[in-house]
């Protein structure tokens, strides 16, 4: 048999609809037109193409755009957009939020995170910034999904957005990201009174310094463990025995528990063994009474 | 009236391969996806994988990629399943199904009864 | 691969009686869901395709229902000759999955 690329006459498409579900993949690619296809493309996520379909449909797409699709023709991708590798995303100039949430919704419940990733990025690439719309719309419909930002992303968020990020939000962050967002955060929250300011201020402590840290320890703020385990390593390893007493307040107690974890452990080797045994927690592992501590670094520093 | 028409039944000793066949009438194949099914007794169905006998563009289940080979000749409207390295985990009915590009399988064959016995 | 589960392997029901026979979806599979029945010693015959749509010269008291992970088979005024197994398919994805079946018997 000769291979038919042509599309039989009882085939032929001029509308996208319903019918074109019965269609076969090489009929499919035969029979409908990429132009038609981009101006119908609002009717396309109302049919239940096959995921195999969707293969043909974005191929057609691709052929007709091949610098990136226009947001016209993103804003109802629908279904389609589970094709979407991150490379083809990265040639998209997304500005619509709706865009964003049709998008975000349809990938919910699928292993979208890169694509996901890559989409956000887009928008804020084509809005200008990390704006507090965009910020709303990632809390709404992708809770987590501004740590998926890169610290250069996120460095373009103004610190009156910082108000409308929830904990939640930040839980998937690394100490890269928390580091951009945490100055922003002290900034939005400077004028909050102690206790108020600590509760804020609490999900971004991840990118705090020392320095603050220590302040904090001065606020009987109560640190609960989890967020001191999640303290840079660098802000608590220079606290003293006592500064960890006056941040943690009652939950000292759960050092016990994570002293094999970083950064306790880090932080019990550079105490001295009886100013932890003030503590009455056992914690074992400090610099054993009488021992002489030479910090190189400094000497190294001086010469 | 659609009918798919598949070869009769099979008794085969291990290690050995079989070729099934179902032929279409009243509709030609060119036009549709055909799909082979497995049910071996007292169980569910397995979709093995499916042909465009247009082009002959296959796909295949996971599970039976290198276990069967289906092919199509437009010529005799004929579809074919072949299963070679035969155990009897492959003792089972075999059917064919047509269907369009949804993906569905809208008409079935009779079956055909694969025995693997030595 | 996408799982489809019919958690109910056995319905029993009398002539006349409605029943309804799920099927779920490990993930959103749209509407690409067929229903089949097979009676004893017979090949698969197909009911419903695309959710909802039944074939020519299916009754009308199969109706099929749903879409996204939960799927719905329900027969209405039960005959004796509906005593088969019922399978639902997935065709959203390759490969293509089948429900474990649910048997219908007959009071």
């Known amino acids: 048999d000769v291979e038919r690329t042509t599309c039989p006459p009882e085939k032929e498409v001029h509308e996208i609809d319903e019918s074109l579900i019965f269609y076969k993949k090489r009929e499919l690619e035969a029979c409908v037109d990429a132009a038609l296809l981009a101006a119908q493309m609002d009717r396309v996520d109302a049919i239940p193409f096959t995921y195999e379909q969707l293969d043909v449909l974005k191929h057609k797409l691709d052929e007709l755009y091949p610098q990136g699709y226009p947001e016209s023709v993103i804003r109802h991708l629908g279904h389609l957009f589970l094709k979407m590798s991150p490379e083809d995303i990265r040639k998209w100039n997304v500005t619509s939020l709706e865009t964003l949430k049709a998008l975000l919704k349809v990938s919910k419940g699928h292993e979208m995170s890169a694509q996901v990733a890559t989409l956000i990025d887009r928008v804020v690439v084509g809005r200008g910034q990390l704006d507090k719309d965009t910020v709303d719309t990632l809390t709404a419909f992708c809770p987590g999904c501004l740590c998926s930002l890169s610290p250069e992303r996120l460095s373009s968020v103004p610190p009156s957005v910082i108000g409308a990020v929830r904990p939640q939000d930040l839980d998937t962050c690394g100490p890269r990201q928390l580091d951009v967002l945490y100055p922003k955060a002290r900034l939005a929250f400077q004028n909050m009174s102690g206790s108020e300011y600590f509760v804020k201020i609490r999900p971004f402590l991840g990118g705090a310094p020392t320095e603050d840290v220590k302040a904090l320890s001065q606020q009987n703020v109560s640190m609960d463990l989890a967020t001191f385990m999640k303290l840079r390593r660098e802000a608590v390893l220079p606290l003293t025995v006592a500064e960890v007493q006056k941040l943690l307040g009652p939950h000292v107690e759960g050092l016990k528990v994570e002293e094999q974890h970083s950064p306790v452990r880090d932080w019990i080797l550079k105490q001295r063994q009886d100013d932890l045994d003030t503590l009455g927690l056992g914690l074992q592992g400090g610099i054993p009474n009488g021992y002489l501590i030479l910090d190189l670094s400094v000497r190294e520093a001086l010469s | 009236e659609v009918q798919l028409q598949q070869s009769g039944a099979e008794l085969v000793k291990p290690g050995a391969s079989v070729k099934l066949s179902c032929t279409a009438s009243?509709?030609?194949?060119?036009?549709?996806?055909m799909h082979w099914v497995k049910q071996r007794t007292e169980q569910g169905l397995e979709w093995i994988g499916r042909i465009d006998p247009e082009d002959g563009e296959t796909k295949y289940a996971p599970k039976f990629q290198g276990k069967a080979t289906i092919t199509a000749d437009t010529s005799s409207n004929t579809a074919y399943l072949q299963l070679s390295s035969l155990t009897s985990e492959d003792t089972a009915v075999y059917y064919c199904?047509?269907?369009?590009?949804?993906?569905?399988?809208?008409?079935w064959g009779q079956g055909t009864s694969v025995t693997v016995s030595s | 691969d996408i799982v489809m589960t019919q958690s109910q392997k056995f319905m029993s029901t009398s002539v006349g009686d409605r029943v309804s026979i799920t099927c779920k979806a490990s993930q959103n599979v749209r509407t690409a869901v067929g229903w089949y029945q097979q009676k004893p010693g017979q090949s698969p015959k197909a009911l419903i395709y695309l959710a909802s749509n039944r074939h020519t010269g299916v009754p009308d008291r199969f109706t099929g229902s749903g879409s996204g992970t939960d799927f719905t088979l329900t027969i209405s005024n039960v005959q004796s000759e509906d005593l088969a197994d019922y399978f639902c398919l997935q065709h959203w994805n390759s490969p293509y999955t089948f429900g474990g079946g649910t048997k219908l018997v007959i009071k």
């Open positions: 009243a509709f030609n194949i060119k036009d549709y996806y």
């Open positions: 199904a047509s269907g369009s590009g949804t993906g569905a399988m809208d008409y």
